[in-house]
């Protein structure tokens, strides 16, 4: 008969055979023959595959390393890598989350639209009409300026995106 | 009943020749690798050879001791597994066995053996 | 090819002892070791496939262990059926090679 020139799924062709692959976690030792299974190895420690494979060296996990911001957030097993994140007030400079860089402020001006997480940054928005910040920060949101009228009291000076309105009392009608 | 009888041997000279049958009965024979296992007096195994299945295209292999003097062959139509023996020599003295060569992936075996034929090579 | 050494070549034992005999691979076999048991004038017989799977009919007092070249049969309690020859064949290389065998004698 003619050898196989495709294998079904979980397997791979070799010297006319179909062989079956190493399942995740395990890596090739050898090759299947007509009279012997494929011979797979657990991964070590600190190694891992994480699909079904012929790879006959496991990868690496990867290392979460401080002196770059990094932390483990999830260890890695022989059949996932291990994910970093940033430390507290960092995020991931990439998807992959290789460095980290520190949290970005917003500027007086500019409030919090999103707090930043472990691998995304602060997202800022300018203080609309009505609102104001006159910190830099990471947290802080714009806040609305005081209403005066509710304090029985009038604008004295009027706010801007950077500061509050200042209230005053009512000028008194004379008699 | 499932089972394999074999024929064919006796005494033959140095150099002569003999074809050994083995008849197959109780299993679809077509479907399984057949083997040749000999022994000789007072010795233990020794594989000679096997031909492979219908779907395997019923190619041969051979132990060092025997290629290009033996031939393995099979008639499916009759169930019967032959031993071709040419150019035979003293040291080929010995019982022969047919033997039905199974399994899986994870691990063949001899796992039905006829009661043996046999030989003897002498002048 | 694979060399396949068994030990010992002979034992003597009796009615319900334990028996084991050991067969050496020159190579690690991956656990392709078969055992067969073999009496005077008659065709062998498979016990053990794939160090330690038992044939189909084979009593549960045989049974197979072993990995990388070293490999066991152990006979848990011996009976009188099971004076014989056994012989370990290896199956992950052509070509098939079996041991020298190990005749258990009645003491």
């Known amino acids: 008969p003619e050898p196989p020139t495709a294998c079904r799924e979980k397997q791979y062709l070799i010297n006319s055979q179909c062989c079956s692959l190493c399942q995740p976690g395990q890596k090739l030792v050898s090759d299947c023959t007509e009279f012997t299974e494929t011979e797979c190895l657990p991964c070590g420690e600190s190694e891992f595959l994480d699909t079904w494979n012929r790879e006959t060296h496991c990868h690496q996990h990867k290392y979460c390393d401080p002196n770059l911001g990094l932390r483990v957030q999830q260890k890695g097993t022989s059949e996932t890598d291990t994910i970093c994140t940033c430390e507290e007030g960092w995020h991931c400079t990439s998807e992959a989350c290789e460095s980290c860089v520190l949290h970005r402020s917003c500027s007086p001006g500019f409030g919090v639209k999103q707090i930043a997480t472990g691998v995304s940054d602060t997202i800022c928005e300018p203080c609309p009409v009505g609102f104001f910040s006159n910190v830099s920060s990471a947290f802080e949101k714009c806040h609305p300026w005081t209403s005066c009228e509710t304090k029985d009291l009038v604008v004295q000076q009027a706010g801007t995106n950077k500061t509050d309105v200042v209230c005053g009392p009512q000028d008194r009608l004379r008699a | 009943e499932v089972q394999l009888v074999e024929s064919g041997g006796g005494l033959v000279q140095p150099g002569g020749s003999l074809r050994l049958s083995c008849a197959a009965s109780?299993?679809?024979?077509?479907?399984?690798?057949m083997s040749w296992v000999r022994q000789a007096p007072g010795k233990g195994l020794e594989w000679v050879g096997f031909i492979r299945n219908k779907a395997n295209g019923y190619t041969t292999e051979y132990a060092a001791s025997v290629k290009g003097r033996f031939t393995i062959s099979r008639d499916n139509s009759k169930s019967t597994l032959y031993l071709q023996m040419n150019s035979l020599r003293a040291e080929d003295t010995a019982v022969y066995y047919c033997a039905r060569y199974g399994g899986l992936k994870k691990g063949w075996y001899f796992d039905l053996w006829g009661q043996g034929t046999l030989v003897t090579v002498s002048s | 090819d694979i060399q396949m050494t068994q030990s010992p070549s002979s034992l003597s034992a009796s009615v319900g002892d334990r028996v084991t005999i050991t067969c050496r691979a020159s190579q690690g076999i991956r656990n392709y070791l078969n055992w067969y048991q073999q009496k005077p004038g008659k065709a062998p017989k498979l016990l053990i496939y794939y160090t330690s799977s038992l044939q189909s009919g084979v009593p549960s007092r045989f049974s197979g262990s072993g990995s990388g070249t070293d490999y066991t049969l152990t006979i848990s309690s011996l009976q009188p059926e099971d004076f014989a020859t056994y012989y370990c064949?290896?199956?992950?290389?052509?070509?098939?090679?079996f041991g020298g065998g190990t005749k258990v004698e009645i003491k």
């Open positions: 109780g299993f679809t024979f077509s479907d399984y690798y």
């Open positions: 064949q290896q199956g992950i290389n052509l070509p098939w090679t």
